[in-house]
C-alpha cells in the first residue's frame, strides 16, 4: 500500500524532518505550512490548526517561503542618482542601481546603497580603464606624444598632431600647434571617447596601480571607520 | 587606524550658512580623494561632494549645485565643506568618507545639520 500523505499540521516520525514547504513549529511540535512568498504568517499552527497566513502590506515583502509574523521592509526610494530596475513588490525588495555616469561606491546585498559621479582624468591624464557599474574610472598619465585637454570620464590620450613644421611643440595636456602648412595625424581627429559601460554585474576588479608620478584622482583610501548602519540615522 | 572626525553642524534657518570640517588622521591625507555623503530622515545614503586628492577636480551633486563648496587644507589634514543658501531638504546627518579604488570604505561617525525656521 502506498504511504498514506500527511496533512498539515502532524507529527513528524521520530528523527525525520518535515516535508519541503513546511516547518517544525517548537511549540506545537508538529510540521506545519510555511507561507508562500508575498505573505506571512499571521496566525502560529497548533496541534489541531495549520499556519494562517496573510498577505505583505504595501511597501513590505517576502521573497521566500516562509513562517515569519511581519513582512520585511521594502528598501527606501531610489535616491537621485540611481534607477530602480526592480520595483518594490509584494515578493521582492526594490533594488536600485547606479546611473549613467556613476558607479557604485557603497554595495550592498542587492543594488547599491550608494552611488558616486565616475572619476574624471584631468588635463594631462586619460582613461586607462572605463567605468563599470561598480567600479570607478581608472586615470593614467598621458605618454609622450600624446595629450588630453579635457577633464573627462570618457576621453583617452590622443596622439599629438605630426606637424610638417611645429609651431608650439605638444605636451601632456595640449596638442601640438602646427604652422599654416596641413598637418597629418596618425589618428582620426576629434575627442576620443570611451562608450559609457552598460550595466554590468560584474565583480569588483582591483584597478591596476598608477605610476607613482600620477597623483591618485580617486575622490576616494586605507582601513578605518566603517559606513553608516543600512537604514541608520544617526545619534 | 584611520580616523575621520567631522564638526561643524547644527540648527541654522533657511537661507542660512554652516562650514562642516573633517580632520584626518591615521593616513596620508594628502594622498587620497574625500567625499561627503548625507543621509535624510528616512532616506538613503545621498552623495553630496567629493574633491580630488591635489584639489584640482571637484564634483557636486546636483541638488547642492552653486550652494555647497568643498575645499581641503592639507596642511592641516583637514577637508571643508561651506553650505550656503540651506534648504530644508538639506536637513540630514552629513558624513566626511573616503576609501581605496573607488569604494567608500570608511567613515566618520557624522554631524547633524539641521535646517527649520
Known amino acids: 500500500l502506498p504511504a498514506q500523505v500527511a496533512f498539515t499540521p502532524y507529527a513528524p516520525e521520530p528523527g525525520s524532518t518535515c516535508r519541503l514547504r513546511e516547518y517544525y513549529d517548537q511549540t506545537a511540535q508538529m510540521c506545519c505550512s510555511k507561507c508562500s512568498p508575498g505573505q506571512h504568517a499571521k496566525v502560529f499552527c497548533t496541534k489541531t490548526s495549520d499556519t494562517v497566513c496573510d498577505s505583505c502590506e504595501d511597501s513590505t515583502y517576502t521573497q521566500l517561503w516562509n513562517w515569519v509574523p511581519e513582512c520585511l521592509s521594502c528598501g527606501s526610494r531610489c535616491s537621485s542618482d540611481q534607477v530602480e530596475t526592480q520595483a518594490c513588490t509584494r515578493e521582492q525588495n526594490r533594488i536600485c542601481t547606479c546611473r549613467p555616469g556613476w558607479y557604485c561606491a557603497l554595495s550592498k546585498q542587492e543594488g547599491c546603497r550608494l552611488c558616486a559621479p565616475l572619476r574624471k582624468c584631468r588635463p594631462g591624464f586619460g582613461v586607462a580603464r572605463p567605468g563599470t557599474e561598480t567600479s570607478d574610472v581608472v586615470c593614467k598619465p598621458c605618454a609622450p606624444g600624446t595629450f588630453s585637454n579635457t577633464t573627462s570620464s570618457t576621453d583617452i590620450c590622443r596622439p599629438h598632431q605630426i606637424c610638417n613644421v611645429v609651431a608650439i611643440p605638444g605636451n601632456a595636456s595640449m596638442d601640438a600647434v602646427c604652422t599654416s602648412t596641413s598637418p597629418t595625424r596618425s589618428m582620426a581627429p576629434g575627442a576620443v571617447h570611451l562608450p559609457q559601460p552598460v550595466s554590468t554585474r560584474s565583480q569588483h576588479t582591483q584597478p591596476t596601480p598608477e605610476p607613482s608620478t600620477a597623483p591618485s584622482t580617486s575622490f576616494l583610501l586605507p582601513m578605518g571607520p566603517s559606513p553608516p548602519a543600512e537604514g541608520s540615522t544617526g545619534d | 587606524d584611520v580616523q575621520l572626525v567631522e564638526s561643524g553642524g547644527g540648527l541654522v534657518q533657511p537661507g542660512g550658512s554652516l562650514r562642516l570640517s573633517c580632520g584626518g588622521s591615521?593616513?596620508?591625507?594628502?594622498?587620497?580623494?574625500m567625499s561627503w555623503v548625507r543621509q535624510a530622515p528616512g532616506k538613503g545614503l545621498e552623495w553630496v561632494s567629493g574633491i580630488y586628492d591635489d584639489g584640482s577636480v571637484t564634483d557636486y551633486a546636483d541638488s547642492v549645485k552653486g550652494r555647497f563648496t568643498i575645499s581641503r587644507d592639507d596642511a592641516k589634514n583637514t577637508v571643508y565643506l561651506q553650505m550656503n543658501s540651506l534648504k530644508s531638504e538639506d536637513t540630514a546627518l552629513y558624513y566626511c568618507a573616503t576609501g581605496e579604488d573607488g569604494e567608500l570604505n570608511y567613515w566618520g561617525q557624522g554631524t547633524q545639520v539641521t535646517v527649520s525656521s
Open positions: 591615521g593616513f596620508t591625507f594628502s594622498s587620497y580623494g
